[in-house]
């Protein structure tokens, strides 16, 4: 038996930050679980981890180069990624493992979310604007 995961197909980070919500076909309340976010088509780079446990507060881990926070819903984990760089534009996959209570469960691979990080293109205002027209 596998947990199903739903993610937005695409998110655009205009301000170098994005909220990626991973929605599960499973209630995480009072469970011990490990939710993670993986970068790349092959999910090779794990960038964020949220560890949840019925007896202690949520623990969030960010890989060096990523600034990540996590929020828990009954059937979701939302990863809040900040200070993203244009070169971190990629596809990101949500994963989940539930360890307790038994049985151990994990997810079917999701379709992923393309996060498109838009660079900040600030148009400099001219220092000496020309004379205003009457």
């Amino acid at each position: 038996n596998k947990i199903l995961v739903k993610q937005s197909p695409m998110l655009v980070a205009y301000d170098n930050a994005v909220n990626l919500s991973c929605k599960y076909s499973y209630n995480l309340f009072s469970r011990e679980f490990r939710a993670s976010l993986h970068k790349g088509l092959d999910s090779a780079v794990e960038v964020c981890v949220v560890y949840g446990n019925y007896s202690q507060q949520l623990q969030v881990y960010s890989k060096t180069g990523f600034n990540c926070d996590g929020k828990l819903g009954n059937e979701s984990v939302t990863f809040y990624l900040q200070n993203l760089y244009v070169n971190q534009t990629d596809i990101y996959f949500c994963k989940i493992e539930v360890m307790y209570p038994p049985p151990y469960l994990d997810n079917e691979k999701s379709n992923g979310t393309i996060i498109h990080v838009k660079g900040k293109h600030l148009c400099p205002s001219p220092l000496f604007p020309g004379p205003s027209k009457p």
Epitope: R34, S36, E46, Y51, Q59, Y61, K63, M99, D106
Partner: nanobody, 124 residues
Framework: EVQLVQSGGGLVQTGGSLRLSCAAS????????MGWFRQAPGKEREFVAA????????DYADSVKGRFTISRDNAKNTVYLEMNSLKPEDTAIYYC?????????????????WGQGTQVTVKP
Amino acid sequence: EVQLVQSGGGLVQTGGSLRLSCAASGRMFSNYAMGWFRQAPGKEREFVAAINYRRDSADYADSVKGRFTISRDNAKNTVYLEMNSLKPEDTAIYYCGFTYAGWASSRRDDYNYWGQGTQVTVKP
């Protein structure tokens, strides 16, 4: 809950070698990292080395690079620290740590569980 049991360590002459082991037991996820830290008298606990689950990524403190090697046996849930060319400044209590992060983290705060500690003493 994860338990870590360390073995190895002891007294060795400068230039000698030692091997530390740390076995993890309890509820384990499919991906986690383990690392070694050390604490000398009157000093903070400092990072030594860490390795990720897939064993394709390891990180070392500059002071031990080229002398220490971290490895792990996933079938046994055990991590090892091979220490060669030991120096008196390597004298410390060595602790293994377990983190739910999947990468070889050097951040002490990332580690959730700790072993009981093993004394390593290097004589000049």
